[in-house]
Amino acid sequence: MKVLQEPTCVSDYMSISTCEWKMNGPTNCSTELRLLYQLVFLLSEAHTCIPENNGGAGCVCHLLMDDVVSADNYTLDLWAGQQLLWKGSFKPSEHVKPRAPGNLTVHTNVSDTLLLTWSNPYPPDNYLYNHLTYAVNIWSENDPADFRIYNVTYLEPSLRIAASTLKSGISYRARVRAWAQCYNTTWSEWSPSTKWHNSYREPFEQH
């Protein structure tokens, strides 16, 4: 039994890091493998993660961690029974993938303005809480070409757009994702999408 693709890990900079790897053949990850991880720290305790299958030869492990700080560094040991298959390390602050925003809502009752709001996925005491920026994706269910991205570079989790920038009388969907420049993170996953029917009064045209 050998590791074909070494574990790569990303952290949500809160309580979970996710490591993925591939074995050289079909593997029952949960019964055959264990990923041990330990904070490089005096007297720190070792933890064991039981991996799950992720495709035939792929494995994934969700490592539970205390709130992450930038100095944290973990040793990782991948075991198959008594055999050490791979040894490595992981610094969560250097491999951050933020949590996805939630509770995306489209408020259509403001006159001819669409107000999109969502929730910051972090509690106020987490470092990322005040460092997230967002991308909002809006698309038409009827027209695949009607697809747009709005970059929200301010901290408030909301976006206002004129309803007239979208076509009237058709349904749209929106979703939002986050990233943090401070840690040069990857983008989060997209939030679940939300749907609304866009309608507004066309301005009266005089001829």
């Epitope: 904070l39 720290f41 005096l42 007297l43 305790e45 709130d67 700080v69």
Partner: antibody
Framework: EVKLVESGGGLVKPGGSLKLSCAAS????????MSWVRQTPEKRLEWVAS???????YYLDSVKGRFTISRDNARNILYLQVSSLRSEDTAMYYC?????????WGQGTLVTVSA | QIVLTQSPAIMSASPGDMVTISCSAS?????MYWYQQKPGSSPKPWIY???NLASGVPARFSGSGSGTSYSLTISSMEAEDAATYYC?????????FGAGTKLELK
């Protein structure tokens, strides 16, 4: 809820001995390193000894050879055997859950060394 | 051994003030821990691994720093924050504490 309760302190003459205990609950005791810390009457905090989850032990130089830290994982109890006591060992002794995760302290047990 | 020097030794602050307590290490450490102690009570873990708040600690507290320079900050002082604060290094044995900073209410 993590709980640490120290006991075993008391008044002892110089050169005497005591065995301090710390009863732990609310977490998997065997998985964590544990430590003893003391606070002198002048309110100075001083680390005394630690024991890892794998039973490795570490001591403050001034207590080496006189104090022994140990643990009973079956009963969830941390011990500190203190002997050849000196007046400078007079302090409130606290047990602590150590390691990288959130630390917890007990309420302490008082050791007074006096003739 | 690593010596921790806290400053100031004593300070007073009015309600609403921002308060910063410093802890300087004689050599570089990866993390700093902070404890709060009120008269007649045992020390309480307050901040661990530099910036994580212990359970029940109000969000007005924060910790920061790296290398040899660390600090505890209270964004807006409240009466209940009057106490003595100790820093501790967990970098190498022997584990050592600062002498404490006594924070009084003005």
């Amino acid at each position: 809820e993590v709980k640490l309760v120290e006991s075993g302190g008391g008044l002892v003459k110089p050169g005497g001995s005591l065995k301090l205990s710390c009863a732990a609950s609310g977490f998997t005791f065997s998985s964590y390193a544990m430590s003893w810390v003391r606070q002198t009457p002048e309110k100075r905090l001083e680390w005394v000894a630690s024991i890892s989850s794998g039973d490795s032990t570490y001591y403050l130089d001034s207590v080496k050879g006189r104090f022994t830290i140990s643990r009973d994982n079956a009963r969830n109890i941390l011990y500190l055997q203190v002997s050849s006591l000196r007046s400078e060992d007079t302090a409130m002794y606290y047990c602590e859950r150590s390691g990288g995760s959130a630390p917890y302290w007990g309420q302490g047990t008082l050791v007074t060394v006096s003739a | 051994q690593i010596v921790l020097t806290q400053s100031p030794a004593i300070m007073s602050a009015s309600p609403g003030d921002m308060v910063t307590i410093s802890c300087s290490a004689s050599s570089s450490v990866n993390y700093m821990y902070w404890y709060q102690q009120k008269p007649g009570s045992s020390p309480k873990p307050w901040i661990y691994r530099t910036s994580n708040l212990a359970s029940g600690v109000p969000a007005r507290f924060s910790g920061s720093g790296s290398g040899t320079s660390y600090s505890l900050t209270i964004s807006s002082m409240e009466a209940e924050d009057a106490a003595t604060y100790y820093c501790q290094q967990y970098h190498s044995f022997p584990l050592t504490f600062g002498a404490g900073t006594k924070l009084e209410l003005k």
